[in-house]
C-alpha cells in the first residue's frame, strides 16, 4: 500500500523558519504534489505549494521555496513573519497524486517538545486518504 510521510522541522539557526519534508512510498509515478496547512486539501486546508515533476513548482506566502528533493520527495521552506510562531501549532498536509494509485495524503506537525533543528518522525498522521 502506498504511504505518504511528513516531517516538520524548525531551523536551528532561525526560529522563525520551518521546513516541511514529504515523501511518497509507493510504486507509482507522481503526477502532482500539493502542500496545505490547517488541514487536508479540500477539507479546510489552505494550499501553500503545488509541485509538478515536469511543469515546475509554485509556492505562495508564507511559503518561501518549494523544491523536489528526489523523484518521490519534496521540501517546502516557510518563513514566519509574525512575532509569535503560528507554525509551531499548525498541521501541514502533503497530498501526492500518482498513477495508477490515485491520491494519498498525510499530515504532520512540529512535535510540542521539539528543539530547534529536530524534526518530527517520518510517521504519517492517520489522515491517510485515497481518493
Amino acid at each position: 500500500t502506498p504511504e505518504v510521510w511528513v516531517q516538520v522541522q524548525m531551523e536551528a539557526t532561525e526560529l522563525s523558519s520551518f521546513t516541511v519534508h514529504c515523501g511518497f512510498l509507493g510504486p507509482g509515478s507522481i503526477s502532482l504534489v500539493t502542500v496545505s496547512w490547517g488541514g487536508p486539501d479540500g477539507a479546510g486546508g489552505t494550499k501553500l505549494a503545488v509541485l509538478h515533476p515536469e511543469l515546475g513548482t509554485r509556492q505562495w506566502a508564507p511559503a518561501r521555496q518549494a523544491r523536489w528533493e528526489t523523484q518521490s520527495s519534496i521540501s517546502l521552506a516557510l518563513e514566519d513573519s509574525g512575532a509569535s510562531s503560528p507554525f509551531a501549532n499548525t498541521t501541514f498536509c502533503c497530498k501526492f497524486a500518482s498513477f495508477p494509485e490515485g491520491s494519498w495524503e498525510s499530515c504532520g506537525s512540529l512535535p510540542p517538545s521539539s528543539d530547534p533543528g529536530l524534526s518530527a518522525p517520518p510517521t504519517p498522521v492517520p489522515i491517510l486518504r485515497a481518493d
Epitope: 502532482l32 500539493t34 496545505s36 489552505t46 494550499k47 503545488v50 509538478h52 515533476p53 515536469e54 511543469l55 515546475g56 509554485r58 505562495w60 506566502a61 523544491r67 523536489w68 528533493e69 528526489t70 523523484q71 519534496i74 497524486a97
Partner: antibody
C-alpha cells in the same frame, strides 16, 4: 475541460485605472490558480504574476509590482487584475492562464490613449 | 531574472520540410532533485492565445502531434518539427518554468513558403 473567459476590450485615458476579469469554469487539479501575462506589440510575452485562490496570496514579477494588483473571488471562480497609473506602455493584450499555462483565456486588449 | 534567447527570430520553410529552432537560458533549468528540466514551448497562431506544446523540455502536451519534438537539457534546448504542415504557421516561444519570474523567449516566427 477548463475554460477561461476574459472581460472585453478596454480603452482608457492615461493616468486612469482598469480592472480585467477572468472567469474559470470546468475542473482542474490545481483549482483556479491563475497567471497573468502581458503581450506587447503582438510578440513579447511577460509574466506578471499569479494568485492563489485559497488565501489570495500573490506572486509578482518585480517589474509589475505597484502596477498590477491580483485578486480572486473563489466563490465565483473569477480572478481579477487591476492596473493603475496607466500609460501608453501599458497598451497590450493581457491573458490569464491556469497555473501551469496549459489553458489560456482569449485575451483582453487594453488601449491607453488620450 | 533568467534571460531566454531564441534563434532564429524567423524562418521560412516549405511544407514537408524539417525545421529546428533553438532556445538558450542564462541559467540552468535543470532541477537537481528530480533531474527534470523546467522548460516549456508554446505555439501562438495569429489572433489566438499561446498554446502549450511541450513541457519538461521534452514531454508533449496531450493532443500535440508527434511531429513536434522537444530536446535539450540545462541551458540549451531545441524544438523540432519533423515535417512542417501549413497549419504550423505561428510564433513559437520557449519559457523558463524553473524560477520566478517565469520569463519567455522573444519567439521564433515560422513562415510557410
Amino acid at each position: 475541460e477548463v475554460q477561461l473567459q476574459q472581460s472585453g476590450p478596454e480603452v482608457v485615458k492615461p493616468g486612469a485605472s482598469v480592472k480585467i476579469s477572468c472567469k474559470a469554469s470546468g475542473n482542474t487539479l490545481t483549482d483556479y490558480f491563475i497567471n497573468w501575462v502581458k503581450q506587447s506589440h503582438g510578440k513579447n510575452l511577460e509574466w506578471i504574476g499569479d494568485i492563489n485562490p485559497d488565501n489570495g496570496a500573490g506572486n509578482y514579477n518585480q517589474k509589475f509590482k505597484g502596477k498590477a494588483t491580483l485578486t480572486v473571488d473563489k466563490s465565483s471562480g473569477t480572478a481579477f487584475m487591476g492596473l493603475r497609473s496607466l500609460t501608453s506602455e501599458d497598451s497590450a493584450v493581457y491573458y490569464c492562464a491556469t497555473l501551469y499555462f496549459d489553458y489560456w483565456g482569449q485575451g483582453t486588449t487594453l488601449t491607453v490613449s488620450s | 531574472d533568467i534571460v531566454m534567447t531564441q534563434s532564429p527570430s524567423s524562418l521560412s520553410v516549405s511544407t514537408g520540410e524539417k525545421v529546428t529552432m533553438s532556445c538558450r537560458s542564462s541559467q540552468s533549468l535543470l532541477n537537481s532533485g528530480n533531474q527534470k528540466n523546467y522548460l516549456a514551448w508554446y505555439q501562438q497562431k495569429p489572433g489566438q492565445p499561446p498554446k502549450l506544446l511541450i513541457y519538461g523540455a521534452s514531454t508533449r502536451e496531450s493532443g500535440v502531434p508527434d511531429r513536434f519534438t522537444g530536446s535539450g537539457s540545462g541551458t540549451d534546448f531545441t524544438l523540432t518539427i519533423s515535417s512542417v504542415q501549413a497549419e504550423d504557421l505561428a510564433i513559437y516561444y520557449c519559457q523558463n518554468a524553473h524560477t520566478s519570474p517565469y520569463t519567455f523567449g522573444g519567439g521564433t516566427r515560422l513562415e510557410i513558403k
